[in-house]
Amino acid sequence: GITIPRNPGCPNSEDKNFPRTVMVNLNIHNRNTNTNPKRSSDYYNRSTSPWNLHRNEDPERYPSVIWEAKCRHLGCINADGNVDYHMNSVPIQQEILVLRREPPHCPNSFRLEKILVSVGCTCVTPIVHHVA
Amino acid sequence: GITIPRNPGCPNSEDKNFPRTVMVNLNIHNRNTNTNPKRSSDYYNRSTSPWNLHRNEDPERYPSVIWEAKCRHLGCINADGNVDYHMNSVPIQQEILVLRREPPHCPNSFRLEKILVSVGCTCVTPIVHHVA
């Protein structure tokens, strides 16, 4: 493979904590410019496994506000608009990266943290356990 | 009250880029210790709006691998196992934070970036537009 020369403008990597402590520019580049206008914002109501969004707020974290999905029903909504308990509403979870302020009281020092969030719900066929 | 002095280990805030350039410790703290064992890993097959997971890889990004969900059908799977086109399979999207190496090829310098990822799919009632 091609060896890419180290950019001379790179921060110093002689630091004893390197490569575990890095510099991060927080001027966020948002790649979501051509976001589909039919975005998922109304799916939580129209889904056969509808969900509510709950706010999880923590000023010592970035992003400080995360929206957590909670499925409204154990079952799924059928064609008649009733809950069908032969199917299950389940949360779709994803592991995301957040920045945690650390040490405390340092406004510009963070630690990377992984948290599991429920993004929405989907309707699944249940796993049926037959008793012998 | 007790005055907590600014932690002497805090990075320098006199930097002209502060507070937009921060120090981040990459020793990830994982808060997902009590992850539900009945996790969403098999939901992609059991859902009435099943999806496939596609690998999105970028060595200049952290995390370098992100899994993107693509709904298998336009419609949803009905009780007979057939695709019902009166309902729609739609992706549930979430905005996530990633770290992008910047300047390129600097191992310890990053920029925060927001990207939109599809985490899974859900089955929704379609919005019907009636023509006058």
């Epitope: 707020e57 992003p63 400080s64 929206w67 009281h105 406004p107 | 927001k114």
Partner: antibody, heavy 122, light 109 residues
Framework: EVQLVESGGGLVQPGGSLRLSCAAS?????????MCWVRQAPGKGLEWIGC?????????DYASWARGRFTISRDNSKNTVYLQMNSLRAEDTAVYYC?????????????WGQGTLVTVSS | DIQMTQSPSSLSASVGDRVTITCQAS??????LAWYQQKPGKAPKLLIY???TLASGVPSRFSGSGSGTDFTLTISSLQPEDFATYYC????????????FGGGTKLTV
């Protein structure tokens, strides 16, 4: 230039209603921001009214005294936030400021408008 | 709601003086406190956030300290442009978010 410009203030009779607008420029409403209203009665201190999330989830917070009579809304396509004030009283006479909270640090207001004066009097 | 008590409500000082303004919260607010400066007819201007972090472009003669319930804003050597009203502001979150302001301290010559 990043700025907030309030409008819609003026004289209103007690019991009346008024809608204030705050137009943002130099940045776009998104999941990075919360847009807030703060007021200041003549010769008095600052008083927080409430905030609205600028992302694609509808969520608001209000000061306990403001809940019910004051409603904050937004139009992301116009990059504008509104404050609907009903059943106005003389003590609501104040300069009303629009302020922004950056999602990077939600503990303070990082940008303020110049304010618009609302006078409630018969 | 958390009450923010600021003192003194007014203060006379001279150019070059060292000035201290205090703010007390009715319950602990960690270090989630900001200080603003406001001049007549103008909007407030952020000076300090997270109790002790200087906002961008603010002169280093301004400093903040404290955590929990007791906080202090200090101006080490008063300049003519510093005569204004100062407000402390807290952030708090329980079931919903709230912000509160102190009553203000008017600094005059």
């Amino acid at each position: 230039e990043v700025q907030l410009v309030e409008s819609g203030g003026g004289l209103v009779q007690p019991g009346g209603s008024l809608r204030l607008s705050c137009a943002a420029s130099g940045f776009s409403f998104s999941s990075d921001y919360w847009m807030c209203w703060v007021r200041q009665a003549p010769g008095k201190g600052l008083e927080w009214i409430g905030c609205i999330y600028a992302g694609d989830v509808d969520d608001t917070d209000y000061a306990s005294w403001a809940r019910g009579r004051f409603t904050i809304s937004r139009d992301n396509s116009k990059n504008t936030v509104y404050l609907q004030m009903n059943s106005l009283r003389a003590e609501d006479t104040a300069v009303y400021y629009c302020a922004r909270v950056d999602g990077f640090d939600i503990t303070y207001f990082d940008l303020w408008g110049q304010g618009t004066l609302v006078t409630v009097s018969s | 709601d958390i009450q923010m008590t600021q003192s003194p409500s007014s203060l006379s000082a001279s150019v070059g003086d060292r000035v201290t303004i205090t703010c007390q919260a009715s319950q602990t607010i960690n270090y989630w406190l900001a200080w603003y400066q406001q001049k007549p007819g103008k909007a407030p201007k952020l000076l300090i956030y997270r109790a002790s972090t200087l906002a961008s472009g603010v002169p280093s003669r301004f400093s903040g300290s404290g955590s929990g319930t007791d906080f202090t804003l200090t101006i080490s050597s008063l300049q003519p442009e510093d005569f204004a009203t100062y407000y402390c502001q807290n952030y708090y979150y329980s079931t919903s978010r709230s912000y509160g302001f102190g009553g203000g301290t008017k600094l005059t010559v």
